[in-house]
């Protein structure tokens, strides 16, 4: 997260760290007791490593009573996701067992009504992604409030030049932005999960390259079918 601040500890009990061989790789969001939603491209970076999900964490390194690392029973990328595009960049991870719920671990309601968030709406994005262009990684969860950007502006040639589909949304990126390592994390508007940070090599913090988020409402049928 660029231009953000440290989050209030455990105030986002849905927040997950998707880890490979014990290292944070991507963000994720607990959407059901045994399921974490993340970004499909995160699996590509995992190679053959052991994928696990950390829940109930604020600090990645310090012991915390609520922290627990779960093995992944099943990884289900969206069937249409492909390495060369950010389309359908969603991944569902089934935990090896149901998460132990409590004040620091709780699923987040996700948007099912397929309607665009009003441009200008302030939404919260959180993650353990880099906090500087130099690539500094934070130990504690960071967050930032970002205004939603209308799709027409996001599709301008100097922004994303027509790449933003109806199944994506954008948020402003003027110095405050999601960045590398935040992929798969939640974009939360009015207490509801609206978007998932897409993965990719997008430049961060440049206002002409807005953050791109996969709209979960657009994938309600798929999510329901996997969770069923």
């Amino acid at each position: 997260i660029l231009g953000g601040r440290e989050a209030e500890a455990h105030a986002r009990p849905y927040m997950a760290s998707v880890q490979v061989n014990g290292e944070h790789l991507c963000g994720g969001v607990l959407v059901a007791e045994q399921w974490v939603l993340s970004a499909a491209h995160c699996l590509e970076d995992a190679a053959d490593g052991k994928v696990q999900v950390l829940l109930g964490a604020h600090s990645l390194s310090q012991p915390e009573p609520s922290k627990r690392l779960y093995d992944v029973l099943r990884a289900v990328p969206h069937p249409d996701s492909r390495p060369d595009t950010i389309d359908h960049d969603l991944l569902l991870l089934q935990l090896s067992e149901k998460a132990t719920l409590g004040p620091a671990v709780r699923p987040l309601p996700w948007q099912r009504v397929d309607r665009d968030v009003e441009p200008g709406t302030l939404c919260d994005v959180a993650g353990w992604g880099i906090v500087s262009h130099a690539g500094r990684r934070p130990d504690r969860l960071q967050h930032v409030l970002l205004p939603v950007l209308d799709r027409a502006t996001c599709n301008r040639r100097t922004h994303h030049d027509g790449a933003i589909t109806q199944r994506m949304m954008c948020a402003e990126s003027n110095r405050r932005d999601s960045c590398k390592g935040d992929s798969g994390g939640p974009l939360v508007c009015g207490g509801v999960l609206e978007g998932v940070v897409t993965s990719g090599s997008r430049v961060c913090g440049n206002r002409k390259k807005p953050g791109i988020y996969t709209r979960v409402a657009s994938y309600a049928a798929w999510i329901d079918s996997v969770l069923a």
Epitope: R156, R157, T158, G162, V203
Partner: antibody, heavy 116, light 112 residues
Framework: EVQLQQSGPELVKPGASVKISCKAS????????MNWVKQSHGKSLEWIGD????????SCNQKFKGKATLTVDKSSSTAYMELRSLTSGDSAVYYC?????????WGQGTLVTVSA | DVLMTQTPLSLPVSLGDQASISCRSS???????????LEWYLQKPGQSPKLLIY???NRFSGVPDRFSGSGSGTDFTLKISRVEAEDLGVYYC?????????FGAGTKLELK
Amino acid sequence: EVQLQQSGPELVKPGASVKISCKASGYTFTDHYMNWVKQSHGKSLEWIGDINPNNGGTSCNQKFKGKATLTVDKSSSTAYMELRSLTSGDSAVYYCTREGASFAFWGQGTLVTVSA
Amino acid sequence: DVLMTQTPLSLPVSLGDQASISCRSSQSIVHSNGDTYLEWYLQKPGQSPKLLIYKVSNRFSGVPDRFSGSGSGTDFTLKISRVEAEDLGVYYCFQGSHVPVTFGAGTKLELK
């Protein structure tokens, strides 16, 4: 399939105004800016301005300030350009073109002829 | 405004020839985001312009690979490796990095 269908040719008198239309189909109208371009006979292309269909916000080439007014009607997915105080120098083909990807999609053009 | 100067204004060719069109901008068209929004369009008589190349060297979908774009900063080139009859028309370079966006005067590719 993305299509931009423009209104037909116009023959107008000097000093009058004309409003030409560009009806979009094959995509969500509010997802892309609409731009307008002028091409005088046998000449190059000149950018007039653009409009964000979400909020009607416009940006205009200084050269066309006071000459062109851009509007949209979201309900019919149609962009409009009104040209006022017409002179012979405004006789041209006017194109609408969708922004993103680049200017990949153009209307067929509307010929405006200004003549007494 | 950024002036886009194309040379030559007329380019007589024989079918199968290689053709090269130059475009020079009056100032750098590298955008503040690091990208260069230099595009090439082809307009055939009685038709609307068609996008060929975007961001200097990227062919738009469906554009044959005999078309290639190159250049940087202020100097850009469009090359057609083997001219076919359907390639004849007026070629325009365009910059989208600075407002107002501007087109070159055009280069007419015609048969000798």
